[in-house]
């Protein structure tokens, strides 16, 4: 997987009135590592690794750049002609990637009410709208605002490409990203299926990277890919990654089955613990976390993109 | 048959290595997890650790970690096991054999390794 | 680590006796209990597994029993080729460690 920064910035009106301040996330190849604090009004890292990142150096430079897109995107919300009543909302999202071939990718992409309404390629700075009429409308609204001053412009996108990677390379330079690795916690449950039958669950916690082999085995030996059932690979919200895989088997059959967990290189395995049976069968709930933004974002209902 | 081959006996130097094979045969190699374990002369057995033929990945007794290094070779259905930094203490017994799921079904015959100035 | 206690460390039984080996385990190991038997010089073979499951080609005077923290190994009859020692193994978490075996010698 490439290495990625990722910038989630959003800004609020409320009957057409922007509102000062702004909620700011950045996300390391995929896990939180900043948030913009609105109380102390700095960028603030995610947990220890973000904070190994960069060591001893102070967040100024990322409290600077935070700031200064908050106001950009501030002054682009004031720009939306079609504001109504209530509470409105202009997100920004920046990507860019370095994958292992040293070939670069930059994005942005604008969604408004939680509606994407147009995308940059900030390399080729090809624009791409969607087809609903909203979105052409909004899409020509924002782009008249951004091409004001083209030459401004111009150097604008090419910078943000640019800072972009910069700050990625800075980060990877740490080493801390690259070297990071949290083993996972696995834990096996087995629980009432069918009449003489039982699902075993094995689940995998608090892990990163993300790549992880999950899987069961009968008798030393990897059960077929169809009658596994797996969950995705998600975030937990520390920094680190959940995953499971399922399968149904005979009851009294249980210590013929083994989880096998394999990750960065190490392995484990994990037999079915013997007990009672579960009779209700609790699988994660398919949720994405919100990271503990601001709860006006609950309150509101407003889409969250990740 | 399932079978595991062994290399034959080593006598070496303190502070040097070796590296100990484990040729299976009667069935697919990677398919099942392989383990080396410890036998110290007239002593028990200690696990060493374990490898996947298939991937590679492998998983340690904190306690031999830093001594053995386990790896496989696909093409030739061979695990090894590499011990390095020998003293008197690592002269014993090594055992390559087969996890059948939560236990072990074939062992190796066993390379007697003597380490000695 | 779970830590498992073999005894006796050596039994003297004549043939055609009954002995029994047990194997204490530090915490709760689930069944997941195996049994070897080791003649000197040669490596070790599977008896038991899964705490009582005989293993192919192993006569049925051997079984074994026991769950949770404690497991023993019974041998009935016993026949010349049974002497020699036997070791317990647990599969419930890594590492996977062995009791420290039990010498069996003819009186």
């Known amino acids: 997987e490439p290495h990625s920064l990722r910038y989630n910035l959003t800004v609020l009106s409320w009957d057409g009135s922007v509102q000062s301040g702004f909620l700011a996330e950045v996300h390391l190849d995929g896990q939180p590592f900043l948030r913009y604090d609105r109380q102390k009004c700095r960028a603030k890292p995610q947990g220890q690794w973000a904070e190994d990142v960069l060591g001893n150096k102070t967040w100024d430079r990322e409290t600077r750049d935070l700031t200064g897109n908050g106001k950009d995107l501030r002054m682009t919300l004031a720009h939306i002609k079609d504001q109504k009543e209530g509470l409105h909302s202009l997100q920004e999202i920046r990507v860019c990637e370095i994958h292992e071939d040293n070939s670069t990718r930059s994005s942005q992409h604008f969604y408004y009410d939680g509606e994407l309404f147009l995308s940059q390629n900030l390399e080729t700075e090809e624009w791409t709208v969607p087809q609903s009429s909203r979105a052409q409308t909004l899409a020509m609204n924002v782009r008249n605002f951004l091409k004001e001053d083209a030459m401004k412009t111009k150097t604008h996108y090419h910078a943000m490409h640019a800072d972009c990677l910069q700050e990625l390379r800075r980060y990877l330079e740490s080493g801390v990203v690259l070297r990071r690795t949290v083993p996972p916690m696995v834990n096996v449950t087995r629980s009432e299926a069918s009449e003489g039958n039982i699902t075993v669950t094995c689940r995998a916690s608090s892990f990163y990277p993300r790549n992880i082999i999950l899987t069961w085995r009968q008798d030393g030996v990897s059960l077929s890919h169809d009658t596994q059932q797996w969950g995705d690979v998600l975030p937990d919200g520390n920094g680190t990654y959940q995953t499971w895989v399922a399968t149904r088997i005979c009851r009294g059959e249980e210590q013929r089955f083994t989880c096998y967990m394999e990750h960065s290189g190490n392995h484990s395995t994990h037999p079915v613990p013997s007990g009672k049976v579960l009779v209700l069968q609790s699988h994660w709930q398919h949720h994405h976390h919100h990271h503990g933004l601001n709860d006006i974002f609950e309150a509101q209902k407003i889409e969250w993109h990740e | 048959q399932v079978q595991l081959q062994q290399s034959g006996a080593e006598l070496v130097r303190p502070g040097t290595s070796v590296k100990v094979s484990c040729k299976a045969s009667g069935y697919a190699f990677t398919d099942y997890l392989i383990e080396w374990v410890k036998q110290r002369p007239g002593q028990g057995l200690e696990w060493i650790g374990g490898i996947n033929p298939g991937s590679g990945s492998t998983n340690y007794n904190e306690k031999f970690k830093g001594k053995a290094i386990l790896t496989a070779d696909k093409s030739s259905s061979t695990a090894y096991m590499q011990l390095s930094s020998l003293t008197s203490d690592d002269s014993a017994v090594y055992f390559c054999?087969?996890?059948?799921?939560?236990?072990?079904?074939?062992w190796g015959q066993g390379t007697t390794l003597t380490v000695s100035s | 680590d779970i830590l498992l206690t073999q005894s006796p460390a050596s039994l003297s039984a004549s043939v055609g006796e009954t002995v029994t080996i047990t194997c204490r385990a530090s915490g709760n190991i689930h069944n997941y209990l195996a049994w070897y038997q080791q003649k000197q010089g040669k490596s070790p073979q599977l008896l038991v597994y899964h705490a009582k499951t005989l293993a192919d080609g192993v006569p049925s005077r051997f079984s074994g029993s026991g769950s949770g923290t404690q497991y023993s190994l019974k041998i009935n009859s016993l026949q010349p080729e049974d002497f020699g020692s036997y070791y317990c193994q647990h599969f419930w978490s890594t590492p996977w460690t062995f009791g420290g075996g039990t010498k069996l010698e003819i009186k």
């Open positions: 054999a087969r996890l059948d799921g939560n236990y072990v079904g074939y």
